[in-house]
């Protein structure tokens, strides 16, 4: 009689993560008597995957009833496959021995490859805000995919970026892989509404790439421009001085009026107007009683924006001049303004 052969007909099997892998194995004879066991890998450290008679293998089921006397089909199914299950599986026939069963013949092995989807890309920006014209770095990470081949692209508002570096780890063979990419983005004043997108394409995604986004509103700081102007008012002895705070982002802003260097009032931007580009405008005014001053008054509008060092703009109020002839009227932007009399 011909010696028993262990046949594993599939050289390789490809399974998607989460699915069930079927590993086929048949024996050509019932002799010698002894069990079949499945292992992953070869050599002394091989991992036992299934033992017909002993051990706990909750993910493994047999394709046929191994207790049938004439059974020669030793195929198994492994459920809920993960990338960690990748490897070469051997169907091994043992013959009964004492004290331990003795390995008799092994199949040629079946290589199990696992296709695993990458995790949703996570995009993170710099820890601190930056101002326009500065270059900032964004990182994109995705994990757990297999096989290793993957494509990553960066976009800003739909326009593909070219200044980025990407690494896929580990470099050698692994059950699954991770990708890490860093892109450099130059900020502009119009970027409050901008988005940076990291797009990952992988064979498991069937042409429908995964995207991770970061809003530049979390990254950008647009410093305000200040303009201090003086408008006449009806009363002969009163002057209205306004401080226009324009094109700033984010909204966090504190304004202080100084009169000849002395703090007159501090307020926080509340009722702001939003520009189309996402930046904000705000205006504050002071109502100055000129008759209370003998000398010229230096009025300073000092703005602290988003915790940055204060910027200021000053206006010299000439007490001798007729108030109605000074300044230009820009009262159209006075919504949400504040009043203050100086006596």
């Amino acid at each position: 009689e011909e010696e028993l052969q262990v046949i594993q007909p599939d050289k390789s099997v490809l399974v998607a993560a989460g699915e069930t892998a079927t590993l086929r194995c048949t024996a050509t004879s019932l002799i010698p008597v002894g069990p079949i066991q499945w292992f992953r890998g070869a050599g002394p450290g091989r991992e036992l995957i299934y033992n017909q008679k002993e051990g706990h293998f909750p993910r493994v089921t047999t394709v046929s009833d191994l207790t049938k006397r004439n059974n020669m089909d030793f195929s198994i199914r492994i459920g809920n496959i993960t990338p960690a299950d990748a490897g070469t599986y051997y169907c091994v026939k043992f013959r009964k021995g004492s004290p331990d069963d003795v390995e008799f013949k092994s199949g040629a092995g079946t290589e199990l490859s696992v296709r695993a989807k990458p995790s949703a890309p996570v995009v993170s920006g710099p820890a601190a805000r930056a101002t326009p014209q500065h270059t900032v770095s964004f990182t994109c990470e995705s994990h757990g995919f297999s096989p290793r081949d993957i494509t990553l692209k960066w976009f800003k508002n739909g326009n593909e970026l070219s200044d980025f570096q990407t690494n896929v780890d580990p470099v050698g063979e692994s059950v699954s892989y991770s990708i890490h990419s860093t892109a450099k983005v130059v900020l502009t004043r119009e970027d409050v509404h901008s988005q940076v997108i990291c797009e990952v394409a992988h064979v498991t995604l069937q042409g429908d790439p995964l995207r991770g986004t970061a809003n530049l509103s979390e990254t950008i700081r647009v410093p305000p421009t200040l303009e201090v102007t003086q408008q006449p008012v009806r009363a002969e002895n009163q002057v209205n001085v306004t401080c226009q705070v324009r094109k700033f982002y984010p909204q966090r802003l504190q304004l202080t009026w100084l009169e000849n260097g002395n703090v007159s009032r501090t307020e926080t931007a509340s009722t702001v107007t939003e520009n189309k580009d996402g930046t904000y405008n705000w205006m504050s005014w002071l109502l100055v009683n000129v008759s209370a001053h003998r000398d010229d008054v230096k009025l300073t509008c000092q703005v602290e924006h988003d915790g940055q060092p204060a910027v200021s703009k000053s206006h010299d109020l000439k007490v001798s001049a007729h108030p109605k002839e000074q300044g230009s009227n820009t009262a159209a932007e006075n919504t949400g303004s504040n009043e203050r009399n100086i006596y």
């Epitope: 008597v33 991992e47 036992l48 017909q52 008679k53 051990g55 293998f57 207790t67 004290p99």
Partner: antibody, heavy 114, light 108 residues
Framework: EVQLVQSGAEVKKPGATVKISCKAS????????IHWVQQAPGKGLEWMGR????????KHNPKFHDRVTITVDTSTNTAYMELSSLRSEDTAVYYC???????WGQGTTVTVSS | EIVLTQSPATLSLSPGERATLSCRAS???????LYWYQQKPGQAPRLLIY???NLASGIPARFSGSGSGTDFTLTISSLEPEDFAVYYC?????????FGGGTKVEIK
């Protein structure tokens, strides 16, 4: 539901023989080995031996070899463990265990006393 | 025969503490064949960990197993009142199958 139901407690004299049964249900009896494990009072677990119900093949712990006999009756899905030449140190709880090591019988107390 | 030596024999801890139990084999055991059990008084042992590091069905995630070769560890990350029991390691890599002597985890 998988169950291994063992026979009741036994009191035996030194030199006698005890035979404990373990009736299996809820799984294919011939699928896996049935093991027997001893636990003396306040002591640890000791593997005694196992049987393959499919063909009656047995393995024993040399410590018990000449005194232990493990058998099965596949018609009733029952495994048996017979321990002969009993001595006081055989006073213990005896468990039958399915080959997956998940399913254990409730244990059978054997007291050897003169 | 492969002798499994468990240490310590007794571990006195309070609920919420971390328990680390050791099992050392006299010769190398492939991880696939190393199991851990919990036993409470008057009850049969219960399988906790199979293949050195896999959690058996219904076992809380605070239990974990690790190790390879001759050194294996069972860890209980934060002891619950119901975890105070005796724990055994077990090898079925070669005959005769053997168990460790057990570690009793008791309330301090």
């Amino acid at each position: 539901e998988v169950q291994l139901v063992q026979s009741g407690a036994e009191v035996k004299k030194p030199g006698a023989t005890v035979k404990i049964s373990c009736k299996a249900s809820g799984f294919n009896f011939e699928d896996t080995y049935i093991h027997w494990v001893q636990q003396a009072p306040g002591k640890g677990l000791e593997w005694m031996g196992r049987i393959d119900p499919a063909d009656g093949d047995t393995k024993h712990n040399p410590k018990f070899h000449d005194r232990v006999t493990i058998t099965v009756d596949t018609s009733t899905n029952t495994a048996y463990m017979e321990l002969s030449s009993l001595r006081s140190e055989d006073t213990a709880v005896y468990y039958c265990v399915r080959g997956n090591y998940v399913n254990w019988g409730q244990g059978t107390t054997v007291t050897v006393s003169s | 025969e492969i002798v499994l030596t468990q240490s310590p024999a007794t571990l006195s801890l309070s609920p919420g503490e971390r328990a680390t139990l050791s099992c050392r084999a006299s010769s190398s055991v492939t991880s696939s064949y190393l199991y851990w059990y919990q036993q409470k008084p008057g009850q049969a042992p219960r399988l906790l960990i199979y293949s050195a590091s896999n959690l058996a069905s219904g076992i809380p995630a605070r239990f974990s197993g690790s190790g390879s070769g001759t050194d294996f560890t069972l860890t209980i990350s934060s002891l619950e009142p119901e975890d105070f029991a005796v724990y055994y390691c077990h090898q079925w890599y070669s005959y005769p199958r053997t168990f460790g002597g057990g570690t009793k985890v008791e309330i301090k």
